[in-house]
Amino acid sequence: IWELKKDVYVVELDWYPDAPGEMVVLTCDTPEEDGITWTLDQSSEVLGSGKTLTIQVKEFGDAGQYTCHKGGEVLSHSLLLLHKKEDGIWSTDILKDQKEPKNKTFLRCEAKNYSGRFTCWWLTTISTDLTFSVKSSRGSSDPQGVTCGAATLSAERVRGDNKEYEYSVECQEDSACPAAEESLPIEVMVDAVHKLKYENYTSSFFIRDIIKPDPPKNLQLKPLKNSRQVEVSWEYPDTWSTPHSYFSLTFCVQVQGKSKREKKDRVFTDKTSATVICRKNASISVRAQDRYYSSSWSEWASVPCS
Amino acid sequence: RAVPGGSSPAWTQCQQLSQKLCTLAWSAHPLVGHMDLREEGDEETTNDVPHIQCGDGCDPQGLRDNSQFCLQRIHQGLIFYEKLLGSDIFTGEPSLLPDSPVGQLHASLLGLSQLLQPEGHHWETQQIPSLSPSQPWQRLLLRFKILRSLQAFVAVAARVFAHGAATLSP
C-alpha cells in the first residue's frame, strides 16, 4: 500500500481467483483514543472500533472511502483504490491501446518544435468517474523539471457503437536547451483513476523523436508564362524553431489528381519553392520534416491547381 | 579549416558532408541483422558516447561568440563514433551486408573530422572509447543503440554547419 495523495491510498493486488489479498491497517487521524468507529462509503454499518482498523482487501467491494467517527462527528477519511496485477502485469483497463507506433502504446506525444513544449494524449471509452494526473521529468535518476498542466477532454468521437474520449495535456520543460543533443529522455507518467480502480501509464521519449512540424504556411502558386508549369512557394510554419538557418526543414511537394488512383508526382526540396506541372483538377500539397533528423512529417498544406 | 586556436572551418564543405552523414546514418539504421531485434532493457547507452550539451556553445549565439568550443566538441564526437564504427561491434558477426552504408558512414565520419582538424593540429582531451571485445550476441543491440545515438549527434552537427555556412562564412 502507498499514498497517492493526502488521504488516498493505492493497494496493489495480485488478481487471480481466491487470491489472499492484502492486509491493510488504517489509522484514524485524531488525537482521540476511545469511542472511535469505522464505516465504509455511505453505509452506516460499523466495521470496527478503535483507533486502527485492520481489513483484508481482496476485491473492489473492499475498496472505497473508510471513515472514522466519534459520536456522530467525522474524524478522518482514507480512500482506498485498487491497482490490479494479473499474471505479473499491471492492468491497463482504463486507457485504449492506440497501437501506434507499436502495440501497448497508451500515451502518444508530439512536439511542434525544439522549445521543450510537447502535448500528450490518450483515449478511453469511459465517460464518468474518471480523473487523470500527469507528472513529467527529464531523466529518472536525477530528474530535471518538466511542468504539465491539467489533463482536459480534447475530443469525443463515435467509433461504431462506442463513444471514444480523447484527453490531452500540455507540458513544458523548465530549462529547455533546443540546440543541445538530448542524452536523457523525457519521462511522462499518467495516473488514471476510474471509480476505485487505479492504473498508471508511462511514456519515455526524446523530443527529437516526437517532433512533428506544423504544415508549411502561405502556400501559393504562380503560373509561369507560356508553360503548364507553376512555381509553388511556401513559408516555414510560425511554430517552428528559429533561426531557420539552424533549425532547417526539408519539404515534400506533391501533385495529386482528383482521383486517388492517379499517379502522384513528388519532389523533395530544401528550398521554400519548387516548380511543378499543374494538371487540371489536381491539387498541390506540401509538407515539412526536420532536415537533419527523420522524425514525423507534418500534415499536408494544399491548394487547388485551378 | 578549424585550426586549434582560431581560424574558421570550411563551413560549406562541412555542411555538405554533415548533411550526407545524416542521410547515411538514417539509411544504416535499422540495420538488417540476421534476426529481429527483440525489445531490450534500457541499459545505459553504449560506451558513454559524447553528447553535444547545453554548455558546448553549439547554439546559434554560442557559435557567433566563439565557434571553437563547439567545433572541438563535434570533432571529439566524430572521432569517437569513427572508432566505434571501426570496432568489432560493426566488423564482427553478425556480418553487415556487403552494400551496407556503414562503410560509407565510417569513411565520412573520418572525412569530416579531418576537415575540422587537418593533420598536424591537435585538440587536446580526446574522449576515446575504451573498446573491449563485444560478444556477438550483444552486437545487434549495440549497433542499434550506437546508430540511434549517432543520428542525434550528426543532426546537431549538421545544424551547426548549416548555420555556420549561412551566417559565419567569410
Epitope: - | 540476421h34 566488423t91 556480418s95 560478444q135 556477438p136 550476441w137
Partner: antibody, heavy 115, light 107 residues
Framework: QVQLVQSGAEVKKPGASVKVSCKAS????????IHWVRQAPGQGLEWMGY????????NYNEKFKGRVTMTTDTSTSTAYMELRSLRSDDTAVYYC????????WGQGTLVTVSS | DIQMTQSPSSLSASVGDRVTITCRAS??????LHWYQQKPGKAPKLLIY???QSISGVPSRFSGSGSGTDFTLTISSLQPEDFATYYC?????????FGQGTKVEIK
C-alpha cells in the same frame, strides 16, 4: 572473388616461434574480422582468436594468451598469426577465416613441431 | 566456456538416406549456431549459419533447426559427396567453441 591465401607449411623445433600469413583479396580488408582456428591431426577445430584489421584490436582465446600475437598489414591486406614457445602438441593445420557467417577460409598451413 | 556436444560421433548411412546430426550447447546460445562440413585435407566449409540460414551454393538438402541449447542438422537425402565430418560451432560468445565432430561414413 573473395580469397584467403595462406603461407606454406613450416617445420619448427620445440621452443621456437612460427608466423603464418593470410593474404586477403576480393573485398575491403578492414570490413571484417580475421579469425584463426587450428586443427591437430585427427582432432577437432579450436578457435585461437581474432584480429580486427580496422583498428588492430585483438581477442585471444585464454588458452593461447601470452603465446599468440595476431597482426595485420593493411597495405598488403595480410593478416599474421605468430605462435611462440612451440610444443609438439602445437602440431596442427592453422586456418584463417573471415567472419563465421561468411563462407571464406584459407586453405590451411601445416605447422609441424618436432625435435 | 560453452561446451558443444555432438551426437552421434559417427554414423553409417546409404545414399538417399535422411541423416540427422544433433548438437547440444552447455548453455543457451540463442540461434548463434553454425554448421560446417569438412573433407580430409580441406578447410571446413560453412553449410548453415545462425541455426537455419542457408548459404548460397550449398544444396537445399542441408537444413538446420533448433534454438537455445538443442540444434539439428538434417541432410534430407544423402548424396555421395556428403560423406565427410560435420562440426557445429558456438558463435554466441567467447571463446568460440566447436563440437567434436560427427563423421558420416558409407554403410
Amino acid at each position: 572473388q573473395v580469397q584467403l591465401v595462406q603461407s606454406g607449411a613450416e617445420v619448427k623445433k620445440p621452443g621456437a616461434s612460427v608466423k603464418v600469413s593470410c593474404k586477403a583479396s576480393g573485398y575491403t580488408f578492414n570490413r571484417y574480422l580475421i579469425h584463426w582456428v587450428r586443427q591437430a591431426p585427427g582432432q577437432g577445430l579450436e578457435w585461437m582468436g581474432y584480429i580486427n584489421p580496422n583498428n588492430a584490436g585483438t581477442n585471444y582465446n585464454e588458452k593461447f594468451k601470452g603465446r599468440v600475437t595476431m597482426t595485420t598489414d593493411t597495405s598488403t591486406s595480410t593478416a599474421y598469426m605468430e605462435l611462440r614457445s612451440l610444443r609438439s602438441d602445437d602440431t596442427a593445420v592453422y586456418y584463417c577465416a573471415r567472419n563465421w557467417d561468411q563462407a571464406y577460409w584459407g586453405q590451411g598451413t601445416l605447422v609441424t613441431v618436432s625435435s | 566456456d560453452i561446451q558443444m556436444t555432438q551426437s552421434p560421433s559417427s554414423l553409417s548411412a546409404s545414399v538417399g538416406d535422411r541423416v540427422t546430426i544433433t548438437c547440444r550447447a552447455s548453455q543457451s546460445i540463442s540461434d548463434y549456431l553454425h554448421w560446417y562440413q569438412q573433407k580430409p585435407g580441406k578447410a571446413p566449409k560453412l553449410l548453415i549459419y545462425y541455426t537455419s540460414q542457408s548459404i548460397s551454393g550449398v544444396p537445399s538438402r542441408f537444413s538446420g533447426s533448433g534454438s537455445g541449447t538443442d540444434f539439428t542438422l538434417t541432410i534430407s537425402s544423402l548424396q555421395p559427396e556428403d560423406f565427410a565430418t560435420y562440426y557445429c560451432q558456438n558463435g554466441h560468445s567467447f571463446p568460440f567453441t566447436f563440437g567434436q565432430g560427427t563423421k558420416v561414413e558409407i554403410k
